[in-house]
Amino acid sequence: EVEKTACPSGKKAREIDESLIFYKKWELEACVDAALLATQMDRVNAIPFTYEQLDVLKHKLDELYPQGYPESVIQHLGYLFLKMSPEDIRKWNVTSLETLKALLEVNKGHEMSPQVATLIDRFVKGRGQLDKDTLDTLTAFYPGYLCSLSPEELSSVPPSSIWAVRPQDLDTCDPRQLDVLYPKARLAFQNMNGSEYFVKIQSFLGGAPTEDLKALSQQNVSMDLATFMKLRTDAVLPLTVAEVQKLLGPHVEGLKAEERHRPVRDWILRQRQDDLDTLGLGLQGGIPNGYLVLDLSMQEALS
Protein backbone atom coordinates (compact mmCIF):
# COMPACT_ATOMS: atom_id res chain seq x y z
CA GLU A 1 0.00 0.00 0.00
CA VAL A 2 1.18 3.51 -0.77
CA GLU A 3 0.60 5.97 2.03
CA LYS A 4 -2.00 8.68 1.24
CA THR A 5 -0.28 12.07 1.01
CA ALA A 6 -1.32 15.39 -0.52
CA CYS A 7 0.10 16.26 -3.96
CA PRO A 8 2.80 18.97 -3.71
CA SER A 9 1.87 22.32 -5.23
CA GLY A 10 2.26 22.46 -9.03
CA LYS A 11 2.82 18.70 -9.37
CA LYS A 12 -0.73 17.68 -10.23
CA ALA A 13 -0.56 15.68 -13.49
CA ARG A 14 -2.63 17.19 -16.28
CA GLU A 15 -1.68 14.43 -18.69
CA ILE A 16 0.30 11.21 -18.74
CA ASP A 17 3.71 12.19 -20.06
CA GLU A 18 7.45 11.63 -19.57
CA SER A 19 7.72 14.13 -16.72
CA LEU A 20 6.09 11.48 -14.50
CA ILE A 21 9.16 9.24 -14.58
CA PHE A 22 10.82 11.70 -12.15
CA TYR A 23 7.95 11.37 -9.65
CA LYS A 24 8.53 9.38 -6.50
CA LYS A 25 6.06 6.58 -5.82
CA TRP A 26 4.12 8.64 -3.28
CA GLU A 27 3.96 11.57 -5.72
CA LEU A 28 2.51 9.37 -8.44
CA GLU A 29 -0.08 8.11 -6.00
CA ALA A 30 -0.99 11.62 -4.87
CA CYS A 31 -0.72 13.53 -8.13
CA VAL A 32 -2.04 11.22 -10.87
CA ASP A 33 -5.79 11.04 -11.17
CA ALA A 34 -6.96 7.44 -11.78
CA ALA A 35 -9.59 8.55 -14.31
CA LEU A 36 -6.94 10.48 -16.26
CA LEU A 37 -4.71 7.40 -16.22
CA ALA A 38 -7.57 5.23 -17.50
CA THR A 39 -8.28 7.53 -20.43
CA GLN A 40 -4.60 7.89 -21.36
CA MET A 41 -3.45 4.30 -20.79
CA ASP A 42 -2.13 4.13 -24.35
CA ARG A 43 0.62 6.61 -23.35
CA VAL A 44 1.96 4.53 -20.46
CA ASN A 45 3.70 2.07 -22.76
CA ALA A 46 5.78 4.81 -24.39
CA ILE A 47 7.12 6.04 -21.04
CA PRO A 48 10.01 4.17 -19.34
CA PHE A 49 8.44 3.77 -15.90
CA THR A 50 10.22 1.62 -13.33
CA TYR A 51 8.53 -1.54 -12.07
CA GLU A 52 7.88 0.21 -8.76
CA GLN A 53 6.15 3.08 -10.56
CA LEU A 54 4.06 0.61 -12.57
CA ASP A 55 2.95 -0.95 -9.26
CA VAL A 56 1.59 2.43 -8.23
CA LEU A 57 -0.25 2.91 -11.54
CA LYS A 58 -1.76 -0.56 -11.23
CA HIS A 59 -2.88 0.25 -7.70
CA LYS A 60 -4.65 3.36 -8.94
CA LEU A 61 -6.50 1.39 -11.63
CA ASP A 62 -7.46 -1.29 -9.07
CA GLU A 63 -9.01 1.38 -6.87
CA LEU A 64 -10.90 2.90 -9.78
CA TYR A 65 -12.17 -0.46 -11.07
CA PRO A 66 -12.54 -2.85 -8.10
CA GLN A 67 -14.86 -5.13 -10.15
CA GLY A 68 -12.35 -5.46 -12.99
CA TYR A 69 -11.00 -3.19 -15.72
CA PRO A 70 -13.12 -2.25 -18.73
CA GLU A 71 -11.91 -3.48 -22.11
CA SER A 72 -10.98 0.06 -23.21
CA VAL A 73 -8.33 0.06 -20.48
CA ILE A 74 -7.30 -3.58 -20.87
CA GLN A 75 -6.53 -3.08 -24.57
CA HIS A 76 -3.91 -0.43 -23.72
CA LEU A 77 -2.32 -2.07 -20.67
CA GLY A 78 0.89 -2.89 -22.50
CA TYR A 79 3.68 -3.77 -20.07
CA LEU A 80 1.36 -3.15 -17.15
CA PHE A 81 -0.23 -6.48 -18.10
CA LEU A 82 2.88 -8.21 -16.73
CA LYS A 83 1.93 -6.81 -13.30
CA MET A 84 -1.50 -8.43 -13.35
CA SER A 85 -2.25 -11.56 -11.36
CA PRO A 86 -4.51 -14.38 -12.58
CA GLU A 87 -6.99 -13.17 -9.91
CA ASP A 88 -7.04 -9.71 -11.51
CA ILE A 89 -7.59 -11.18 -14.96
CA ARG A 90 -10.48 -13.39 -13.82
CA LYS A 91 -12.46 -10.18 -13.20
CA TRP A 92 -12.09 -9.07 -16.82
CA ASN A 93 -14.46 -9.54 -19.70
CA VAL A 94 -12.31 -9.58 -22.83
CA THR A 95 -14.29 -9.99 -26.05
CA SER A 96 -12.15 -8.31 -28.69
CA LEU A 97 -9.53 -10.36 -30.57
CA GLU A 98 -7.53 -7.12 -30.94
CA THR A 99 -7.33 -6.81 -27.16
CA LEU A 100 -6.16 -10.41 -26.88
CA LYS A 101 -3.49 -9.83 -29.57
CA ALA A 102 -2.27 -6.65 -27.87
CA LEU A 103 -1.75 -8.45 -24.55
CA LEU A 104 -0.18 -11.55 -26.12
CA GLU A 105 2.26 -9.24 -27.92
CA VAL A 106 3.51 -7.99 -24.52
CA ASN A 107 4.35 -11.57 -23.50
CA LYS A 108 5.76 -12.54 -26.91
CA GLY A 109 8.82 -14.77 -26.88
CA HIS A 110 8.20 -15.99 -23.34
CA GLU A 111 6.64 -19.19 -22.10
CA MET A 112 2.92 -19.04 -21.49
CA SER A 113 2.55 -17.47 -18.04
CA PRO A 114 -0.32 -18.20 -15.63
CA GLN A 115 -1.59 -14.69 -16.49
CA VAL A 116 -1.68 -15.46 -20.22
CA ALA A 117 -3.28 -18.86 -19.61
CA THR A 118 -6.00 -17.18 -17.53
CA LEU A 119 -6.52 -14.48 -20.16
CA ILE A 120 -6.91 -17.06 -22.93
CA ASP A 121 -9.25 -19.15 -20.81
CA ARG A 122 -11.45 -16.09 -20.09
CA PHE A 123 -11.45 -15.10 -23.74
CA VAL A 124 -12.31 -18.55 -25.12
CA LYS A 125 -15.02 -19.14 -22.50
CA GLY A 126 -16.50 -15.74 -23.37
CA ARG A 127 -16.66 -16.72 -27.04
CA GLY A 128 -18.18 -20.12 -26.31
CA GLN A 129 -15.85 -22.01 -28.68
CA LEU A 130 -12.36 -21.91 -30.09
CA ASP A 131 -13.13 -20.29 -33.45
CA LYS A 132 -10.73 -20.12 -36.39
CA ASP A 133 -9.55 -16.53 -35.85
CA THR A 134 -8.84 -17.14 -32.17
CA LEU A 135 -7.01 -20.37 -32.89
CA ASP A 136 -5.01 -18.64 -35.61
CA THR A 137 -3.97 -15.93 -33.16
CA LEU A 138 -3.17 -18.27 -30.27
CA THR A 139 -1.10 -20.72 -32.30
CA ALA A 140 0.81 -17.83 -33.90
CA PHE A 141 1.95 -16.74 -30.42
CA TYR A 142 2.10 -20.20 -28.83
CA PRO A 143 2.60 -23.03 -31.36
CA GLY A 144 2.07 -25.57 -28.57
CA TYR A 145 -1.21 -24.05 -27.42
CA LEU A 146 -3.49 -26.63 -29.00
CA CYS A 147 -1.62 -29.49 -27.35
CA SER A 148 -1.92 -27.82 -23.94
CA LEU A 149 -5.70 -28.32 -24.04
CA SER A 150 -7.40 -31.39 -22.62
CA PRO A 151 -9.30 -33.73 -24.95
CA GLU A 152 -12.48 -32.34 -23.40
CA GLU A 153 -11.49 -28.76 -24.23
CA LEU A 154 -10.46 -29.80 -27.74
CA SER A 155 -13.90 -31.25 -28.34
CA SER A 156 -15.23 -27.68 -28.49
CA VAL A 157 -12.98 -26.85 -31.46
CA PRO A 158 -15.21 -26.65 -34.56
CA PRO A 159 -13.92 -28.48 -37.68
CA SER A 160 -13.74 -25.14 -39.53
CA SER A 161 -11.02 -23.99 -37.09
CA ILE A 162 -8.78 -26.88 -38.11
CA TRP A 163 -7.78 -24.93 -41.23
CA ALA A 164 -5.78 -22.60 -38.97
CA VAL A 165 -3.65 -25.43 -37.54
CA ARG A 166 -0.06 -25.77 -38.77
CA PRO A 167 1.97 -29.01 -38.48
CA GLN A 168 4.20 -27.51 -35.76
CA ASP A 169 1.14 -26.72 -33.66
CA LEU A 170 0.63 -30.46 -33.16
CA ASP A 171 4.21 -31.41 -32.32
CA THR A 172 3.56 -31.91 -28.61
CA CYS A 173 0.07 -33.43 -28.87
CA ASP A 174 -0.36 -36.89 -27.38
CA PRO A 175 -2.49 -39.67 -28.93
CA ARG A 176 -5.55 -38.81 -26.84
CA GLN A 177 -5.54 -35.27 -28.19
CA LEU A 178 -5.03 -36.44 -31.78
CA ASP A 179 -7.92 -38.89 -31.33
CA VAL A 180 -10.15 -35.84 -30.84
CA LEU A 181 -8.58 -33.67 -33.53
CA TYR A 182 -8.29 -36.26 -36.32
CA PRO A 183 -12.04 -36.71 -36.98
CA LYS A 184 -12.44 -32.93 -37.07
CA ALA A 185 -9.58 -32.63 -39.57
CA ARG A 186 -11.03 -35.43 -41.69
CA LEU A 187 -14.31 -33.54 -41.81
CA ALA A 188 -12.65 -30.19 -42.50
CA PHE A 189 -10.57 -31.47 -45.42
CA GLN A 190 -13.04 -33.97 -46.88
CA ASN A 191 -13.61 -32.05 -50.11
CA MET A 192 -9.93 -31.84 -51.07
CA ASN A 193 -8.38 -34.05 -53.73
CA GLY A 194 -6.00 -36.91 -52.91
CA SER A 195 -2.55 -35.32 -52.73
CA GLU A 196 -3.76 -32.02 -51.25
CA TYR A 197 -5.85 -33.91 -48.69
CA PHE A 198 -2.83 -35.93 -47.57
CA VAL A 199 -0.67 -32.82 -47.13
CA LYS A 200 -3.31 -31.31 -44.83
CA ILE A 201 -4.33 -34.46 -42.91
CA GLN A 202 -0.75 -35.75 -42.42
CA SER A 203 -0.11 -33.93 -39.12
CA PHE A 204 -3.31 -35.33 -37.61
CA LEU A 205 -2.76 -38.98 -38.58
CA GLY A 206 -1.65 -39.93 -35.07
CA GLY A 207 -5.38 -40.19 -34.40
CA ALA A 208 -6.30 -42.16 -37.53
CA PRO A 209 -7.92 -45.61 -37.32
CA THR A 210 -6.77 -48.64 -39.32
CA GLU A 211 -9.46 -48.34 -41.99
CA ASP A 212 -8.34 -44.80 -42.85
CA LEU A 213 -4.70 -45.90 -43.12
CA LYS A 214 -5.79 -48.74 -45.42
CA ALA A 215 -7.66 -46.23 -47.58
CA LEU A 216 -4.61 -43.94 -47.73
CA SER A 217 -2.43 -46.86 -48.81
CA GLN A 218 -4.46 -47.03 -52.02
CA GLN A 219 -3.76 -43.40 -52.89
CA ASN A 220 -0.02 -43.21 -53.64
CA VAL A 221 0.60 -40.89 -50.71
CA SER A 222 4.26 -41.77 -49.88
CA MET A 223 3.99 -41.19 -46.13
CA ASP A 224 7.35 -40.34 -44.56
CA LEU A 225 8.77 -42.36 -41.67
CA ALA A 226 8.41 -39.53 -39.15
CA THR A 227 4.64 -39.55 -39.75
CA PHE A 228 4.47 -43.35 -39.73
CA MET A 229 6.26 -43.52 -36.38
CA LYS A 230 3.60 -41.26 -34.84
CA LEU A 231 0.70 -43.47 -35.91
CA ARG A 232 -1.26 -45.34 -33.25
CA THR A 233 0.26 -48.79 -32.73
CA ASP A 234 -3.19 -50.37 -32.60
CA ALA A 235 -4.01 -48.78 -35.97
CA VAL A 236 -0.77 -49.99 -37.61
CA LEU A 237 -0.81 -53.61 -36.38
CA PRO A 238 -3.61 -54.86 -38.70
CA LEU A 239 -1.96 -53.42 -41.84
CA THR A 240 -0.54 -55.99 -44.24
CA VAL A 241 2.99 -55.81 -45.62
CA ALA A 242 1.60 -54.80 -49.01
CA GLU A 243 -0.46 -52.01 -47.42
CA VAL A 244 2.51 -50.62 -45.50
CA GLN A 245 4.63 -50.77 -48.65
CA LYS A 246 1.99 -48.82 -50.57
CA LEU A 247 1.46 -46.38 -47.71
CA LEU A 248 5.16 -45.53 -47.43
CA GLY A 249 6.07 -45.78 -51.10
CA PRO A 250 9.78 -44.93 -51.48
CA HIS A 251 10.00 -44.23 -47.74
CA VAL A 252 9.63 -47.96 -47.06
CA GLU A 253 13.45 -48.13 -46.94
CA GLY A 254 13.32 -46.22 -43.66
CA LEU A 255 11.58 -49.13 -41.88
CA LYS A 256 14.93 -50.89 -41.48
CA ALA A 257 16.33 -48.08 -39.31
CA GLU A 258 13.20 -48.13 -37.15
CA GLU A 259 12.76 -51.90 -36.78
CA ARG A 260 13.45 -51.82 -33.03
CA HIS A 261 11.04 -48.98 -32.30
CA ARG A 262 7.29 -48.84 -31.96
CA PRO A 263 5.07 -49.15 -33.91
CA VAL A 264 7.39 -50.84 -36.45
CA ARG A 265 8.70 -53.40 -33.95
CA ASP A 266 5.22 -54.52 -32.93
CA TRP A 267 4.01 -54.55 -36.54
CA ILE A 268 6.92 -56.79 -37.62
CA LEU A 269 6.00 -59.33 -34.94
CA ARG A 270 2.51 -59.61 -36.45
CA GLN A 271 3.64 -60.25 -40.05
CA ARG A 272 4.62 -63.49 -41.75
CA GLN A 273 8.37 -63.59 -42.29
CA ASP A 274 7.79 -64.59 -45.93
CA ASP A 275 5.81 -61.40 -46.47
CA LEU A 276 8.43 -59.24 -44.74
CA ASP A 277 11.12 -60.77 -46.96
CA THR A 278 9.37 -59.46 -50.07
CA LEU A 279 10.21 -55.91 -48.93
CA GLY A 280 13.90 -56.59 -49.42
CA LEU A 281 14.74 -54.73 -46.21
CA GLY A 282 16.19 -57.54 -44.14
CA LEU A 283 13.49 -57.13 -41.49
CA GLN A 284 13.57 -60.03 -39.03
CA GLY A 285 11.21 -61.21 -36.30
CA GLY A 286 8.13 -62.10 -38.31
CA ILE A 287 6.04 -65.23 -37.86
CA PRO A 288 8.00 -68.20 -39.29
CA ASN A 289 6.65 -70.30 -42.17
CA GLY A 290 4.14 -72.95 -41.23
CA TYR A 291 3.03 -71.28 -38.01
CA LEU A 292 -0.70 -70.85 -37.47
CA VAL A 293 -1.77 -67.34 -36.53
CA LEU A 294 -4.62 -67.22 -34.02
CA ASP A 295 -6.53 -63.98 -33.62
CA LEU A 296 -7.15 -64.09 -29.87
CA SER A 297 -9.24 -60.95 -29.89
CA MET A 298 -11.71 -62.70 -32.22
CA GLN A 299 -11.67 -65.78 -29.99
CA GLU A 300 -12.52 -63.67 -26.93
CA ALA A 301 -15.36 -62.01 -28.79
CA LEU A 302 -16.87 -65.38 -29.63
CA SER A 303 -16.56 -66.90 -26.14
Epitope: V252, E253, L279
Partner: antibody, heavy 119, light 107 residues
Amino acid sequence: EVQLLESGGGLVQPGGSLRLSCAASGLTFRNYAMTWVRQAPGKGLEWVSGISVSGGSTYYADSVKGRFTISRDNSKNTLSLQMNSLRAEDTAVYYCVKRGAAVGSFDYWGQGTLVTVSS
Amino acid sequence: DIQMTQSPSSLSASVGDRVTITCRSSQGIGSWLAWYQQKPEKAPKSLIYAASSLQSGVPSRFSGSGSGTDFTLIISSLQPEDFATYYCQQYNSYPLTFGGGTKVEIK
Protein backbone atom coordinates in the same frame (compact mmCIF):
# COMPACT_ATOMS: atom_id res chain seq x y z
CA GLU B 1 29.88 -53.40 -42.27
CA VAL B 2 28.44 -54.09 -45.72
CA GLN B 3 31.10 -54.98 -48.30
CA LEU B 4 30.59 -55.74 -51.98
CA LEU B 5 33.64 -56.98 -53.87
CA GLU B 6 33.49 -57.26 -57.66
CA SER B 7 35.79 -59.47 -59.73
CA GLY B 8 36.03 -60.83 -63.26
CA GLY B 9 36.75 -57.60 -65.14
CA GLY B 10 39.47 -57.33 -67.76
CA LEU B 11 40.25 -56.89 -71.45
CA VAL B 12 38.08 -58.75 -73.94
CA GLN B 13 37.65 -58.57 -77.71
CA PRO B 14 34.41 -57.39 -79.32
CA GLY B 15 31.99 -60.33 -79.57
CA GLY B 16 33.64 -62.02 -76.59
CA SER B 17 32.21 -62.98 -73.20
CA LEU B 18 33.01 -62.20 -69.59
CA ARG B 19 31.47 -63.17 -66.27
CA LEU B 20 31.48 -60.67 -63.42
CA SER B 21 31.02 -61.79 -59.82
CA CYS B 22 30.24 -59.88 -56.66
CA ALA B 23 30.93 -61.34 -53.22
CA ALA B 24 28.77 -59.82 -50.49
CA SER B 25 29.61 -59.77 -46.79
CA GLY B 26 28.36 -57.96 -43.69
CA LEU B 27 24.72 -58.43 -44.67
CA THR B 28 22.13 -61.21 -44.96
CA PHE B 29 22.48 -61.33 -48.73
CA ARG B 30 19.28 -63.31 -49.38
CA ASN B 31 17.19 -60.46 -47.95
CA TYR B 32 18.17 -57.79 -50.47
CA ALA B 33 17.52 -56.98 -54.11
CA MET B 34 20.73 -56.38 -56.06
CA THR B 35 21.71 -54.54 -59.22
CA TRP B 36 24.56 -53.76 -61.58
CA VAL B 37 25.40 -50.19 -62.62
CA ARG B 38 28.15 -49.19 -65.03
CA GLN B 39 30.11 -46.05 -65.84
CA ALA B 40 31.95 -45.56 -69.11
CA PRO B 41 35.26 -43.65 -68.81
CA GLY B 42 34.58 -39.96 -68.18
CA LYS B 43 30.81 -40.50 -68.45
CA GLY B 44 27.82 -40.71 -66.12
CA LEU B 45 26.14 -43.65 -64.41
CA GLU B 46 23.98 -46.17 -66.28
CA TRP B 47 21.79 -48.84 -64.71
CA VAL B 48 22.42 -52.21 -66.35
CA SER B 49 20.44 -54.95 -64.64
CA GLY B 50 18.60 -55.86 -61.45
CA ILE B 51 17.43 -58.98 -59.62
CA SER B 52 14.83 -59.57 -56.91
CA VAL B 53 15.44 -61.03 -53.45
CA SER B 54 14.71 -64.61 -54.51
CA GLY B 55 16.16 -64.29 -58.00
CA GLY B 56 12.75 -64.96 -59.52
CA SER B 57 12.52 -61.55 -61.23
CA THR B 58 15.21 -59.99 -63.40
CA TYR B 59 15.34 -56.63 -65.18
CA TYR B 60 17.61 -55.28 -67.94
CA ALA B 61 18.40 -52.03 -69.70
CA ASP B 62 17.47 -52.13 -73.42
CA SER B 63 21.14 -51.71 -74.33
CA VAL B 64 22.08 -55.10 -72.81
CA LYS B 65 18.83 -57.09 -73.15
CA GLY B 66 19.45 -60.51 -74.75
CA ARG B 67 23.21 -60.27 -74.23
CA PHE B 68 23.62 -60.02 -70.44
CA THR B 69 22.19 -62.33 -67.76
CA ILE B 70 22.02 -61.51 -64.08
CA SER B 71 21.85 -64.25 -61.43
CA ARG B 72 22.43 -64.78 -57.74
CA ASP B 73 23.41 -67.62 -55.44
CA ASN B 74 21.99 -66.88 -52.00
CA SER B 75 23.76 -69.86 -50.45
CA LYS B 76 27.14 -68.39 -51.46
CA ASN B 77 26.26 -64.69 -51.08
CA THR B 78 27.23 -63.97 -54.67
CA LEU B 79 25.78 -61.93 -57.52
CA SER B 80 26.83 -62.58 -61.12
CA LEU B 81 26.56 -60.89 -64.49
CA GLN B 82 27.18 -63.04 -67.56
CA MET B 83 28.08 -60.73 -70.46
CA ASN B 84 28.01 -62.12 -74.00
CA SER B 85 28.44 -60.52 -77.45
CA LEU B 86 30.38 -57.67 -75.91
CA ARG B 87 30.72 -54.38 -77.79
CA ALA B 88 33.12 -51.45 -77.53
CA GLU B 89 30.34 -49.37 -75.92
CA ASP B 90 30.16 -51.87 -73.03
CA THR B 91 33.57 -50.64 -71.88
CA ALA B 92 33.03 -49.30 -68.35
CA VAL B 93 33.58 -49.77 -64.66
CA TYR B 94 30.86 -52.16 -63.45
CA TYR B 95 29.53 -51.67 -59.93
CA CYS B 96 27.73 -54.26 -57.84
CA VAL B 97 25.05 -52.43 -55.86
CA LYS B 98 22.72 -53.36 -53.00
CA ARG B 99 19.22 -51.87 -53.02
CA GLY B 100 17.81 -50.37 -49.82
CA ALA B 101 14.53 -52.19 -50.42
CA ALA B 102 13.05 -54.51 -53.05
CA VAL B 103 12.04 -51.32 -54.87
CA GLY B 104 14.53 -49.05 -53.14
CA SER B 105 17.41 -46.75 -53.95
CA PHE B 106 21.01 -47.93 -54.22
CA ASP B 107 22.36 -47.71 -50.70
CA TYR B 108 25.66 -49.64 -50.89
CA TRP B 109 28.08 -49.78 -53.82
CA GLY B 110 31.09 -51.99 -54.49
CA GLN B 111 34.35 -50.43 -55.63
CA GLY B 112 33.81 -51.57 -59.20
CA THR B 113 35.64 -53.69 -61.76
CA LEU B 114 36.83 -52.39 -65.14
CA VAL B 115 35.69 -54.13 -68.32
CA THR B 116 37.50 -53.08 -71.50
CA VAL B 117 36.17 -54.25 -74.85
CA SER B 118 38.75 -53.63 -77.54
CA SER B 119 40.48 -55.38 -80.39
CA ASP C 1 11.90 -44.31 -70.65
CA ILE C 2 12.01 -41.56 -68.04
CA GLN C 3 14.67 -38.95 -68.81
CA MET C 4 16.40 -37.23 -65.92
CA THR C 5 17.83 -33.76 -66.60
CA GLN C 6 20.24 -32.23 -64.10
CA SER C 7 21.33 -28.61 -63.93
CA PRO C 8 23.80 -27.10 -63.89
CA SER C 9 26.19 -29.63 -65.39
CA SER C 10 28.99 -27.99 -63.40
CA LEU C 11 29.42 -25.18 -60.92
CA SER C 12 32.21 -23.45 -59.03
CA ALA C 13 31.75 -22.66 -55.37
CA SER C 14 33.70 -21.81 -52.23
CA VAL C 15 33.78 -23.49 -48.83
CA GLY C 16 30.81 -22.25 -46.81
CA ASP C 17 28.65 -21.54 -49.87
CA ARG C 18 25.08 -22.78 -50.19
CA VAL C 19 24.85 -24.98 -53.26
CA THR C 20 21.65 -25.91 -55.09
CA ILE C 21 21.41 -28.62 -57.75
CA THR C 22 18.18 -29.33 -59.58
CA CYS C 23 16.89 -32.45 -61.27
CA ARG C 24 13.85 -32.71 -63.54
CA SER C 25 12.16 -35.91 -64.70
CA SER C 26 10.39 -36.19 -68.07
CA GLN C 27 7.30 -37.55 -66.28
CA GLY C 28 5.97 -37.66 -62.73
CA ILE C 29 7.86 -40.00 -60.40
CA GLY C 30 6.26 -39.11 -57.07
CA SER C 31 9.04 -39.17 -54.45
CA TRP C 32 10.95 -42.06 -56.03
CA LEU C 33 14.18 -40.12 -56.39
CA ALA C 34 17.67 -40.60 -54.96
CA TRP C 35 20.83 -38.48 -54.92
CA TYR C 36 24.39 -39.85 -55.03
CA GLN C 37 27.84 -38.32 -54.56
CA GLN C 38 30.86 -39.55 -56.48
CA LYS C 39 34.47 -38.52 -56.01
CA PRO C 40 37.13 -39.16 -58.69
CA GLU C 41 38.15 -42.82 -58.99
CA LYS C 42 35.69 -43.80 -56.26
CA ALA C 43 32.34 -45.58 -56.19
CA PRO C 44 29.22 -43.45 -55.78
CA LYS C 45 27.82 -42.98 -52.29
CA SER C 46 24.14 -42.73 -51.42
CA LEU C 47 23.07 -39.38 -49.91
CA ILE C 48 19.29 -39.18 -50.10
CA TYR C 49 16.43 -41.52 -50.92
CA ALA C 50 12.68 -40.89 -51.32
CA ALA C 51 13.51 -37.34 -52.51
CA SER C 52 14.11 -35.98 -49.00
CA SER C 53 15.17 -38.77 -46.61
CA LEU C 54 18.81 -38.63 -45.53
CA GLN C 55 20.75 -41.89 -45.69
CA SER C 56 22.16 -42.88 -42.34
CA GLY C 57 25.58 -41.34 -41.67
CA VAL C 58 25.13 -38.50 -44.18
CA PRO C 59 25.76 -35.00 -42.71
CA SER C 60 22.66 -32.86 -42.16
CA ARG C 61 24.03 -30.10 -44.39
CA PHE C 62 22.69 -32.20 -47.27
CA SER C 63 18.97 -31.98 -47.89
CA GLY C 64 16.61 -32.93 -50.67
CA SER C 65 13.17 -31.73 -51.64
CA GLY C 66 10.57 -31.99 -54.37
CA SER C 67 8.08 -34.46 -55.76
CA GLY C 68 6.49 -35.17 -59.10
CA THR C 69 8.91 -33.86 -61.72
CA ASP C 70 11.05 -31.21 -59.98
CA PHE C 71 13.65 -32.01 -57.34
CA THR C 72 16.43 -30.17 -55.54
CA LEU C 73 19.57 -31.14 -53.66
CA ILE C 74 20.91 -28.46 -51.32
CA ILE C 75 24.26 -28.39 -49.55
CA SER C 76 23.69 -25.70 -46.93
CA SER C 77 27.34 -24.95 -46.24
CA LEU C 78 29.84 -26.51 -48.64
CA GLN C 79 32.75 -28.33 -46.98
CA PRO C 80 36.12 -29.25 -48.58
CA GLU C 81 35.08 -32.92 -48.75
CA ASP C 82 31.91 -32.05 -50.71
CA PHE C 83 33.71 -31.20 -53.95
CA ALA C 84 32.53 -34.08 -56.15
CA THR C 85 30.02 -35.02 -58.85
CA TYR C 86 26.36 -35.44 -57.83
CA TYR C 87 23.82 -37.62 -59.62
CA CYS C 88 20.06 -37.89 -59.27
CA GLN C 89 18.28 -41.14 -60.09
CA GLN C 90 14.64 -42.14 -60.49
CA TYR C 91 13.55 -45.57 -59.32
CA ASN C 92 9.85 -45.14 -59.99
CA SER C 93 9.90 -47.45 -63.01
CA TYR C 94 12.20 -49.57 -65.17
CA PRO C 95 14.56 -48.81 -66.72
CA LEU C 96 16.02 -47.02 -63.71
CA THR C 97 17.68 -43.85 -64.99
CA PHE C 98 20.26 -41.34 -63.75
CA GLY C 99 20.72 -37.65 -64.42
CA GLY C 100 23.83 -36.57 -66.32
CA GLY C 101 25.59 -35.39 -63.16
CA THR C 102 26.63 -32.04 -61.68
CA LYS C 103 30.30 -31.45 -61.00
CA VAL C 104 30.93 -29.18 -58.00
CA GLU C 105 34.38 -27.62 -58.29
CA ILE C 106 36.45 -25.28 -56.11
CA LYS C 107 36.18 -21.63 -57.13
